[in-house]
């Protein structure tokens, strides 16, 4: 049961990570304009995202503008866009692989194949987490570098936006969930208790093993 619990926890974490990643990529809050010093009353805040930028007036009114030309965009923004989309697609692929190998599905009957699929999905989720982490960390690095660069004028200085924090959370959840899925798969390949297969097999006895019969070394 511990293996199944870890699998469920792993996939729940990766799903949360995927949703977080989607929101992070979509929200125009990667960079927030930093108006600093001289006791200025700022009438507006500028948010910049991967797809659009928004101006929020002091009245609360928000105007957003989608970036016009893909080719006119800075290369780092294009790369961040691409990595974000790839990360989300990779995570979806990981989910499909997991579903194929999950203990409660009949897509694959053989236990070893199931274990391999779950392990593969875990690795795919970890890759997705790393892909999510790259644009987020790259953008954060650029923001911090410019913020403390004495050559950069204030209008060009930015602060870390909420999307970056969501991105870090997404990456962490995908890495953690993927890691858990990898851990649920024993190195030997024999995947835990057989009673998970019982409901799909007419000849299988409807008797489950006692707890002492589990190969506990696989659940450390």
């Amino acid at each position: 049961m511990a293996s199944a619990g870890m699998q469920i926890l792993g996939v729940v974490l990766t799903l949360l990570g995927w949703v977080n990643g989607l929101v992070s990529c979509a929200l125009p809050m990667w960079k927030v304009t930093a108006f600093i010093g001289n006791s200025i009353v700022v009438a507006q805040v500028v948010w910049e995202g991967l797809w659009m930028s928004c101006v929020v007036q002091s009245t609360g009114q928000m105007q957003c503008k989608v970036y016009d030309s893909l080719l006119a965009l800075p290369q780092d923004l294009q790369a961040a866009r691409a990595l974000c989309v790839i990360a989300l697609l990779v995570a979806l692929f990981g989910l499909l692989v997991y579903l194929a190998g999950a203990k409660c599905t009949t897509c694959v009957e053989e236990k070893d194949s199931k274990a391999r699929l779950v392990l593969t999905s875990g690795i795919v989720f970890v890759i997705s987490g790393v892909l999510t982490l790259i644009p987020v960390c790259w953008t954060a690095h650029a923001i911090i570098r410019d913020f403390y660069n004495p050559l950069v004028a204030e209008a060009q200085k930015r602060e870390l936006g909420a999307s970056l924090y969501l991105g870090w959370a997404a990456s962490g959840l995908l890495l953690l969930g993927g890691g858990l899925l990898c851990c649920t798969c024993p190195s030997g390949g024999s995947q835990g208790p057989s009673h998970y297969m019982a409901r799909y097999s007419t000849s299988a006895p409807a008797i489950s093993r006692g707890p002492s019969e589990y190969p506990t070394k696989n659940y450390v």
């Epitope: 108006f35 001289n38 004495p150 050559l151 004028a153 209008a155």
Partner: antibody
Framework: QVQLVQSGAEVKKPGASVKVSCKTS????????MHWVRQAPGQSLEWMGG????????HYNQKFQGRVTITVDKSASTAYMELSSLRSEDTAVYYC?????????????WGAGTLVTVSS | DIQMTQSPDSLAVSLGERATINCKAS??????LAWYQQKPGQVPKLLIS???SLETGVPSRFSGSGSGKDYTLTISSLQAEDVAVYYC?????????FGGGTKVEIK
Amino acid sequence: QVQLVQSGAEVKKPGASVKVSCKTSGYTFTEYTMHWVRQAPGQSLEWMGGIDPNNGNTHYNQKFQGRVTITVDKSASTAYMELSSLRSEDTAVYYCARIYYFGRLYFDFWGAGTLVTVSS
Amino acid sequence: DIQMTQSPDSLAVSLGERATINCKASEDIYNRLAWYQQKPGQVPKLLISGATSLETGVPSRFSGSGSGKDYTLTISSLQAEDVAVYYCQQYWSSPLTFGGGTKVEIK
């Protein structure tokens, strides 16, 4: 007292390059970023770019990007500005000017200027 | 780029009279404005930063005001040594840009 001593006047042919130096003294070199501003005869001032002497990071005016290179020799407390592919409209007085590292981007002290004449 | 427009181009004022120079930015520069004085044959000298803050050693007859896009340099009582070209410079946004200059002369 603070001094920004620039190299002498230069006459160059179109297409050539010029390298102007700015030797500083009287203050801690790394506490100020060094910038270059030019002034064509009878014209206004035009910022070209600047350098952080601590790490060599540069920031250029897009107008000069690719043609201007600003460098520093920290040990000699000297800044350099090289402008390539010179044309007649580059004839100007080139000033080095410093900006306090932890301050805002205005120039609190200027060099005496170097006249660069581009003529065939 | 932020354009800085100075007016007038030149100004002739009697000794002891007030001289007013205007500087208009193409967008809000949030008081990130400096004023420089360049006397004939000399290098620019910083007079005012932050739109209103007088630099050390600058006579109190010089003052700066304004906000948003519009800024003003005032010489309350013009002296002979104030004959110069005055430049405004915004440092809100890169590239740093200067106004076209205002030449102040004695009438």
